[in-house]
């Protein structure tokens, strides 16, 4: 009996009946055993088949078998109801070996030519299975020449049997206060040969509650308790289970903050598994009662560990813990069932006593001393000498705890001194220098510091003067002795002021003419305004209409009089403004250099002389009455003139203040 080729030789070839293509003889038996490499099978088909036909192929036949299984018994030329001829069929071994047996009996009624067949080894596709058969692999099957291998979906690992996919279902830790967990693939069948461990781990103080939901189907056994697949639940104090079968287990109140759930499956079965919904509870905290004028958020039926609430106060009320203010308040429930902070109060906002207003007063409108939310106060300035700047002085205690004006300002109003008030009324004509009376020139300032000079009060902490009068003291402001509120130069009764800083116009050059002869002195304290101390107004844009040629201005000071001495009493003179060209011409002649009179100057005086300001008056104000506002304003600053004061054909020259309004405003706003 020929064996045929064996692996590792190439496995393919031809088989034929004895004597083929001639007729085969009687009483023949021939057997071929073909062997392919592992993972391969043998394919066989006939190119010629002509054997004696007999019932069930009892006489002559070709039998194909693989292992113990007969694949086919063949005879005849064509198949009948009870006999089979190969025709165009291809035959496959079940494993890697194929046995072919040819037999002829003792006689043939006519000659038969036998058979010719060809065979070859081919790869077995182990991944293809017949319907109803178990799949080769659990998840993915991969065929290759001579064999196959299995692989698994993400979340699974190949079991050591190389076919089953075990779930990678351990190490999951649930830390939320509630959640769901289930068997792998639920509600589809759970995987075989798996061991799953799930942990629920909550903060100390919580107790886990387990509820089995939807369906429960774990392989069971009628007599033995869960021998195949089972679910176990373990806490630090007890074990629950094992569970299997089709009945939903009851709720489990673990009284523990940590739970381990173990699920083990064997290699067989087709069950859908389980699903658990877990919640947690803890010792509840006392129900938070909102303080008066406050509310709790969020509102819950109960508050347990880690739950929190906040307190929000009504508008006009604020969170206070005793005397200490809080912007927000949140309390958290602790594991022992107590809140981590005590309840604060919602106290009505108290803006507190309003600040004192310099040169003003405050009046309680709502009620004496009432300073709580929505209370109203009224600020006002001392009448006659002060006026309120910008707002109306009405302030309300707002919810943020600040007194707030109707314009939303939280700063105090400002009481600004009223400027340009004088006890004096102007006469219609010019007459000689006269003694000033109390309140005539309340802006008049006496400046002592090496020489005698003058200035005019602006606001309540600035003095306007001539640059040449304070030039020597520009770096030593504290050396200036500033006096106001007096008529007598030598009187001990005056208001003393001291200089904080001296600002000389940057365009002024000492000993080189008097252009830009203007300076400001900042006082180190505000002075109190009264009938004897009142600031002069700065000129309005329209002021030029009150300072035309021949309009009358008034100069005042303690400068030299006709007798050649400094005046003891404050003197004043009413003098007309002189045409600018006329004045310029008067100072073109020697000894005056050309261009002495500039556009920054104005001139005043009589052509006939006799009325003038003089040495000692320097820095003082030449003032004019604004007939529209009925306030006096400074038009000029006593600057220079002829060597002989009051000389005919010569005039007093004054710094033209209106040209310097931006400079004055900038200095005052910056400093």
């Amino acid at each position: 009996t020929p064996l045929g080729p064996k692996w590792p030789e190439p496995v393919f070839g031809r088989l034929a009946s004895p004597g083929f293509p001639g007729e085969y003889a009687n009483d023949q038996e021939r057997r071929w055993t073909l062997t392919a490499p592992p993972g391969y099978r043998l394919r066989l088909y006939f190119t010629h088949f002509d054997l004696e036909l007999s019932h069930l192929c009892e006489y002559d036949f070709v039998k194909l078998s693989s292992g113990a299984k007969v694949l086919a018994t063949l005879c005849g030329q064509e198949s009948t109801d009870t006999e089979r001829a190969p025709g165009k069929d291809t035959f496959y071994s079940l494993g890697s070996s194929l046995d072919i047996t040819f037999r002829s009996d003792y006689s043939n009624e006519k000659p038969f030519t036998g058979f010719e067949a060809f065979y070859a080894a081919e790869d077995i596709d182990e991944c293809q299975v017949a319907p109803g058969e178990a799949p080769t692999c659990d998840h993915h099957c991969h065929n290759h020449l001579g064999g196959f291998y299995c692989s698994c979906r993400a979340g699974y690992v190949l079991h050591r049997n190389k076919r089953t996919c075990s779930a990678l279902c351990s190490g999951q830790v649930f830390t939320q206060r509630s959640g769901e967990l289930s068997s792998p693939e639920y509600p589809r069948p759970y995987p075989k040969l798996s061991s799953c461990t799930y942990s629920i781990s909550l903060e100390e103080g919580f107790s886990v509650i387990l509820d089995f939901v939807e369906s429960f189907d774990v392989e069971t056994h009628p007599e033995t308790l869960c021998p195949y697949d089972f679910l176990k639940i373990q806490t630090d104090r007890e074990e629950h289970g094992p569970f299997c079968g089709k009945t939903l287990p009851h709720r489990i109140e673990t009284k523990s903050n940590t739970v381990t759930i173990t699920f083990v499956t064997d290699e067989s079965g087709d069950h859908t598994g389980w699903k658990i919904h877990y919640t947690s509870t803890a010792q509840p905290c006392p129900y938070p009662m909102a303080p008066p004028n406050g509310h709790v958020s969020p509102v819950q039926a109960k508050y347990i560990l880690k739950d929190s609430f906040s307190i929000f106060c009504e508008t006009g009320y604020e969170l206070l813990q005793g005397h200490l203010p809080l912007k927000s308040f949140t309390a958290v429930c602790q594991k022992d069932g107590s809140w981590d902070r005590p309840m604060p109060a919602c106290s009505i906002v108290d803006c507190g006593p309003p600040d004192d207003l310099p040169s003003g007063r405050v009046e309680y409108i709502t009620g004496p001393g009432v300073t709580t939310y929505k209370a109203v106060i009224q600020y006002s300035c001392e009448e006659t000498f002060y006026t309120m700047k910008v707002n109306d002085g009405k302030y309300v205690c707002e919810a943020d705890g600040f007194w707030t004006s109707s314009k939303g300002e939280k700063s105090l109003p400002v009481c600004e001194p009223v400027c340009g008030l004088s006890a004096r009324t102007t006469g219609g004509r010019i007459y000689g220098g006269q003694k000033a009376k109390p309140g005539d020139f309340p802006w008049q300032v006496l400046i002592l510091g090496g020489t005698t000079a003058a200035g005019a009060l602006l606001y309540d902490n600035w003095v306007l003067t001539a640059a040449h009068a304070v030039y020597e003291q520009k770096h030593d402001a504290s050396a200036l002795d500033i006096r106001m509120g007096t008529l007598k130069r030598l009187s001990p009764h005056y208001t003393q002021a001291w200089s904080e800083a001296v600002f000389i116009h940057e365009g002024y050059t000492h000993d080189a003419g008097f252009d830009n002869d203007i300076a400001l002195i900042k006082l180190n304290n505000k002075v109190v305004i009264n009938s004897n101390i009142t600031p002069i107004c700065l000129p309005r844009k329209e002021a030029e209409s009150f300072m035309r040629t021949d309009d009358i201005g008034t100069a005042s000071g303690w400068g030299l009089t006709q007798r050649g001495f400094l005046a003891r009493n404050l003197m004043y003179v009413d003098i007309p403004i002189v045409d600018h060209q006329k004045c310029t011409a008067a100072y073109e002649k020697p000894p005056y250099p050309r261009g002495s009179v500039t556009a920054n100057m104005l001139c005043a005086g009589l052509e006939s002389g006799g009325k003038d300001s003089c040495r000692g008056d320097s820095g003082g104000a030449l003032v004019f009455l604004d007939s529209e506002t009925e306030r006096w304003f400074v038009g000029g600053i006593v600057s220079w003139g002829s060597m002989n004061c009051g000389e005919a054909g010569q005039y007093g020259v004054y710094t033209k203040v209106i040209n310097y309004i931006p400079w004055i405003e900038n200095i005052i706003s910056d400093f």
């Epitope: 813990q321 005793g322 005397h323 200490l324 203010p325 809080l326 912007k327 927000s328 902070r341 005590p342 943020d400 705890g401 600040f402």
Partner: antibody
Framework: DVQLQESGPGLVKPSQSLSLTCTVT?????????WNWIRQFPGNKLEWMGY???????SYNPSLKSRISITRDTSKNQFFLQLNSVTTEDTATYYC????????WGQGTSVTVSS | DIVMTQSQKFMSTSVGDRVSVTCKAS??????VAWYQQKPGQSPKALIY???YRYSGVPDRFTGSGSGTDFTLTISDVQSEDLAEYFC?????????FGSGTKLEIK
Amino acid sequence: DVQLQESGPGLVKPSQSLSLTCTVTGYSITSDYAWNWIRQFPGNKLEWMGYISYSGRTSYNPSLKSRISITRDTSKNQFFLQLNSVTTEDTATYYCAVLYALDYWGQGTSVTVSS
Amino acid sequence: DIVMTQSQKFMSTSVGDRVSVTCKASQNVDTNVAWYQQKPGQSPKALIYSASYRYSGVPDRFTGSGSGTDFTLTISDVQSEDLAEYFCQQYNSNPLTFGSGTKLEIK
């Protein structure tokens, strides 16, 4: 971590003003709470001077009200103490602190009032 | 002003002992009381607020109790590092006031 740090001159002349700065790191002074000045006299007696709250409102010890001012600079997360017309009685260690639920103190700065 | 009286200027105790420091307010301060520990050369450190609430990081051997006018700080198992001066403070009303302090000495 919340930290408070006091700074300012260690020596002040009588009748002058004492000015101290508290610099806060790790928490915004506008977020919440009251930001306090507390002083400890030789002998360890503690005195609360006043606070400025998260909103900028102030509360002062009435015994100091005429000469104390507490202000702040939110852009620098600092608050300040100014105590006017000091005398030798104001010699102490000065602390800035946030009190109540958040409680942190600076390390303190020693101030001597002496001519 | 509310006066906070710590009647005992000094208290002597041994390691492992239980000791109570008391503080009395001159008028009702509800539970708006804090306790501070101050070690030599250091700034005060808060232990308790709202009479009985312990700050995080404070050992649980420190407990506070009381309301209204009478307050107590108890150290249940005195350790050598508890050698310090202890101050109570009320923050119920303006001005906030402190007790004069109780110095704890370890025998």
